[in-house]
Interface confidence: low
């Protein structure tokens, strides 16, 4: 139903959905703090621009009695219940910030008018791609997929002289929300990744993964998985691994690899870690002191959602344009705005662009070192370490199929 937006006459409200089911198990208090920090900054920016307006946030909580799994499994209904709550109250802000679960975002998107923007910290799945009024501030699965295809095809680097066309994907169903959708995208038969690879098999059991490590008849030397080093260790332990196996560990929202005192454990020597270029933000922020690295990214996305709204509000107000229009709702894309931790670029579809970093373990120093970076905005790989001290033979990544071409 048509809901009036509290979004005019110098007063602009942000509706923040505080859902019990969330992409990351983050206390709602921390997200509130992130939003409030963002509001402070936005107010300062608007004041600097000579715009004497009021910006506030309304936090919308679900009752938590029905939808209490805490993860994203029952989020579809929770999202719709919150929309119903907004509808009943006849009160909607200029923008909706909040749904982070792919299920809830997808359903809410289907069930709402396209007259206001939705900003999500999450919604990683392919089903949330290309939505006209949805902005995603954490790297979605599509971005990961494009990196992997780009990297697989690369064959002109000193440390990677073979194009790859095969892969195993380990996906056992216990993944976190981000990993679930990242791997889901790689598994999907219609996805870009599947289309570009000649061979791809999903390993669903621990034993399948463990057997592949030394299987002479394996169809690929490359295994993609998602999680942290501890997750890999639980699965792999200290088992022997064939010398030409390459494990790609996707761990985007974890900047612990970049900490000075971190040493890579021995079981990581056959592993390339894909993560995001770290920021050192939030170090002195009231809401961030007790956050883990992953939760820092999640809280930061909420904060950046507020800053993005402030950025767009400023532009529209300065141009004398109406905020409660489809033009405003569709404007949250193809732009760069001042995020909390640096410039944040959104692509043509409102998805955050970032620098992904591929790390390897140096056999000399036992430290994680940057092998290459990848700019999702231009879909381009930039080699960093031209002479990596790899565990692999000749300090080069092996071919993806054993016995094909010189090793």
């Amino acid at each position: 139903s048509q809901v009036s937006q509290n979004c005019h006459n110098g007063s602009y409200e942000i509706s923040v959905l505080m859902m019990g089911n969330s992409a990351f198990a983050e206390p709602l208090k921390n997200l509130e703090d992130a939003v409030n920090e963002g509001l402070e900054i936005v107010r300062g920016r608007l004041q600097n621009a000579g715009l004497n307006v009021t910006v506030n946030a309304t936090f919308m909580y679900s009752d938590g009695l029905i939808h209490n799994s805490g993860d994203c499994r029952s989020s579809t209904c929770e999202g719709l219940d919150l929309l119903r709550k907004i509808s009943n109250a006849q009160r909607m802000g200029c923008v909706l910030i909040g749904p982070s679960c792919t299920y809830s975002t997808f359903q809410m998107y289907l069930d709402t008018e396209l007259s206001y923007p939705m900003i999500s910290a999450g919604s990683f799945g392919l089903s949330c791609d290309y939505k006209e009024t949805l902005t995603r501030l954490m790297s979605p699965a599509r971005k990961l997929m494009y990196f992997l295809v780009n990297f697989w095809k690369t064959n002109d680097l000193p440390f990677k002289t073979y194009s790859w066309s095969t892969s195993y994907v380990y996906k056992n169903g216990t993944e976190t929300e981000d990993c679930f959708w990242y791997l889901n995208a790689l598994e999907a038969s219609v996805s870009y990744f599947s289309h570009e690879l000649g061979f791809k098999v999903v390993l669903r059991q621990d034993k399948e993964f463990q057997d592949i490590l030394m299987d002479h008849n394996r169809k690929s030397n490359v295994i993609i998985m998602c999680g942290g080093p501890e997750f890999l260790y639980k699965l792999k332990g200290d088992r022997a691994v064939a010398e030409d196996i390459v494990i790609i560990l996707v761990d985007l929202f974890n900047d612990q690899y970049f900490e000075d005192n971190v040493t890579a454990p021995d079981y990581m020597k056959n592993v390339l870690v894909l993560t995001l270029s770290p920021g050192n933000s939030l170090l002195n922020s009231s809401f961030s002191r007790n956050l883990s690295p992953t939760k820092r990214d999640f809280a930061l996305a909420y904060l950046n959602g507020i800053l993005l709204f402030g950025h767009m509000l400023k532009i529209f107000l300065e141009n004398g344009e109406n905020i409660t229009t489809p033009k405003f709702a569709h404007a949250f894309r193809n732009l760069t705005f001042e995020g909390y931790d640096g410039p944040v670029t959104l692509d043509d579809w409102g998805d955050v662009d970032s620098t992904m970093v591929l790390l390897y373990t140096s056999v000399d120093t036992k430290k994680y070192k940057v092998l290459l970076t990848y700019d999702t905005h231009v879909n381009k790989t930039y080699p960093v370490d031209m002479s990596p001290t790899f565990t692999w033979k000749n300090s080069k990544l092996p071919n993806d199929i054993t016995g094909r071409g010189p090793q």
């Epitope: 300062g44 600097n48 920021g279 170090l283 909390y340 931790d341």
Partner: antibody, heavy 117, light 108 residues
């Protein structure tokens, strides 16, 4: 109109630490990046580094080991410290507002710092 | 780091003439993140152009910027007496941000 004003000692002894403060008026320090740039007499400009209110700093690698930049939002000020100075650090030091991806739209008038015993 | 080379080092022209200043980068400047500044003796630099071609607030339209990749140009269509100064280009597409060595525009 945003205005920036550098302040600090004009003379520093070799091996000591150069300390400058930039006071921002006419706008909040919370909303932008803030940079330090220097210019030796008769020479070109050299970007030293920047800070944002989150505490995020970025430095020129050539100076990184000697530079500290901090911010005090309550005073609307940000500061530069450059340790172990030599005569080569003698320059006019400017502070500037750094538009989030790097161009500098408001500058202080600059302050000359001479390194000499 | 990206090295910016400005040419010519000195440009001697008369008021009313057209000035063309060049800035060449040692490698491609990401997303055309290049700015031009004007500096007069004893003053701070003043932003003229950002993002290669966008004029800063309050800058007369006789100043224009163009270019992408590694080659950028600042054009002053009709020189006024107050335009004689030193001009610097700056790239901010990759860290560290770097400046060119400057072009001195002097009265002929």
């Amino acid at each position: 109109q945003v205005q920036l004003q550098e302040s600090g000692p004009g003379l520093v002894k070799p091996s000591e630490t150069l300390s400058l403060t930039c006071t921002v008026s006419g706008g909040s320090i919370r909303s932008y990046y803030w940079s330090w740039i220097r210019q030796p007499a008769g020479k070109g400009l050299e970007w030293i580094g920047r800070i944002y209110i989150s505490g995020r700093t970025t430095f020129n690698p050539s100076l990184k080991s000697r530079v500290t930049i901090s911010v005090d939002t309550s005073k609307n000020q940000f500061s530069l410290k450059l340790s172990s100075v030599t005569a080569a650090d003698t320059a006019v030091y400017f502070c500037a507002r750094d538009r989030y991806y790097g161009y500098l739209d408001y500058w202080g008038q600059g302050t000359l710092v001479t390194v000499s015993s | 780091e990206i090295v910016l080379t400005q040419s010519p080092g000195t440009l001697s022209l008369s008021p009313g003439e057209r000035a063309t200043l060049s800035c060449r980068a040692s490698q491609s400047v990401s997303r055309s993140y290049l700015a031009w500044y004007q500096q007069k003796p004893g003053q701070a630099p003043r932003l003229l152009i950002y993002d290669a071609s966008s004029r800063a607030t309050g800058i007369p339209d006789r100043f224009s910027g163009s270019g992408s990749g590694t080659d950028f140009t600042l054009t002053i269509s009709r020189l006024e007496p107050e335009d004689f100064a030193v001009y610097y280009c700056q790239q901010y597409g990759s860290s560290p941000s770097t400046f060119g060595q400057g072009t001195r525009l002097e009265i002929k």
